[in-house]
């Protein structure tokens, strides 16, 4: 239990302990939320203290004071999704359609994401605003039409599912186009009946 | 009492680098962030970086991005500001300074200046 | 980085009369979680560092005569001097800290009428 003495400098627990080099001892840190009030000695160990409102410290440490909180920027393109706490900084995330483009132990600013051409789409991934946008092509049977960042590819209509005949086949740009079976010029219609 | 004190006058020949220290006395030095901001003749001031002695992270103004280094070394308590490829216009007073309500707040105690010229 | 725009550039008001310095930032310093004004106000006397006056907008820093007082919230903030005394005249900073990019504004002169 610290205080205890330490010839080599190292302490046993590393994360919860650290090394004082006036009095050659190992003394404990002051667990997240809290920040040392009055420093160890060989006969008395570290005394922690709360941190003050509007301040936080977030590890075990051996500051003599607490961070300041402080808002996610929006200019950064950076939104809030939990306030501040004396454990936690605020946490930040990227604002809709936008992804981290510089990153420092966390993310400093966002950017637009990227628009997806037509005929592809943006590639699912784990986390959102981790990266810019990859888009891939649209599966077989499938089709985008529109630049943008979010759009998803649809599966083209089946004309038959609606008691039309196909008149043009679907791309991956564009929809099948269907026409009634009993006329005989298909009619300027994307997925649609006609009546 | 918190006293922040740096090194004294320099005058540098445009292209070449200057180091000016800031050592602190009074305060537990490592838990505070030390800001450097400096002042051109007749101007205002400008927050050129920063750093947390405790964790070693330093924090730069984009403008100054690449061509400014902070550091700090706990033993003496003293931060370090080294400008490079220096121009007439860095011609300025460089104050450091430092919070003391929080790690990294608004800043109360400032050094008295170090005067750096660049001229050829 | 936050843009911090002061008016007037310089001030030239009588003794025992009141002196307004507006600050005005490119965004918003209001952190709404905390409803605290991230904007602080210096002065700086020629030869001399800048000294710090108010913090959170409105708050006095101790020692710091009750003649200056800080108002404002979001964007728009104010220094008051409300009785300009002879060791009043300096050089008036706003600057923010709501990012470690701290900024300044450019300044603004008080000066005896």
């Known amino acids: 239990v610290p205080p205890y003495g330490s010839e080599n400098q190292t302490c046993r627990d590393q994360e919860k302990e650290y090394y004082e080099p006036r009095h050659r001892i190992c003394c404990s840190r002051c667990p997240p939320g809290t920040y040392v009030s009055a420093k160890c000695s060989r006969s008395r160990d570290t005394v922690c203290a709360t941190c003050a409102e509007n301040s936080y410290n977030e590890h075990w440490n051996y500051l003599t004071i607490c961070q300041l909180c402080r808002p996610c920027d929006p200019v950064m393109g950076l939104e809030e999704i939990a306030p501040c706490t004396s454990k936690r900084k605020t946490q930040c995330r990227c604002q809709p359609g936008m992804f981290c483009a510089a990153w420092a132990l966390e993310c400093t600013h966002c950017e637009l994401l990227s628009d997806c051409p037509p005929g592809t789409e943006a590639e699912l991934k784990d986390e959102v605003g981790k990266g810019n946008n990859h888009c891939v092509p649209c599966k077989a049977g499938h089709f985008q039409n529109t630049s943008s960042p979010s759009a998803r590819c649809q599966p083209h209509t089946r004309c038959e599912d609606q008691g039309l005949v196909e008149a043009a086949p679907g791309t991956a740009q564009s929809d099948t186009t269907c026409r009634n079976p009993s006329e005989s010029l298909p009619p300027e219609m994307s997925g649609t009946m006609l009546m | 009492q918190v006293q922040l004190v740096q090194s004294g006058a320099e005058v540098k020949k445009p292209g070449s680098s200057v180091k000016v220290s800031c050592k602190a006395s009074?305060?537990?030095?490592?838990?505070?962030?030390i800001s450097w901001v400096r002042q051109a003749p007749g101007q205002g001031l400008e927050w050129m970086g920063g750093i947390i002695p405790i964790h070693g992270t330093a924090n730069y103004a984009q403008k100054f991005q690449g061509r400014v280094t902070i550091t700090a070394d706990k033993s003496t308590s003293t931060a370090y500001m080294e400008l490079s490829s220096l121009r007439s216009e860095d011609t300025a007073v460089y104050y450091c300074a430092r919070p003391s309500y929080y790690l990294d707040g608004w800043l109360d105690y400032w050094g008295q200046g170090t005067t750096v010229t660049v001229s050829s | 980085d936050i843009v911090m725009t002061q008016s007037p550039d310089s001030l030239a008001v009588s003794l025992g009369e009141r002196a307004t310095i507006n600050c005005k930032s490119s965004?918003?310093?209001?952190?709404?979680?905390?409803?605290?004004?991230?904007l602080a106000w210096y002065q700086q006397k020629p030869g001399q560092p800048p000294k710090l006056l108010i913090y959170w907008a409105s708050t006095r820093e101790s020692g710091v005569p009750d003649r200056f007082s800080g108002s404002g919230s979001g964007t728009d903030f104010t220094l008051t001097i409300s009785s300009l005394q002879a060791e009043d005249v300096a050089v008036y900073y706003c600057?923010?800290?709501?990012?470690?990019?701290?900024?300044f504004g450019q300044g603004t002169k008080v000066e005896i009428k």
């Open positions: 009074g305060g537990t030095f490592s838990s505070y962030a």
């Open positions: 965004q918003s310093v209001l952190y709404s979680s905390n409803n605290k004004n991230y």
């Open positions: 600057s923010q800290y709501y990012t470690t990019h701290y900024t």
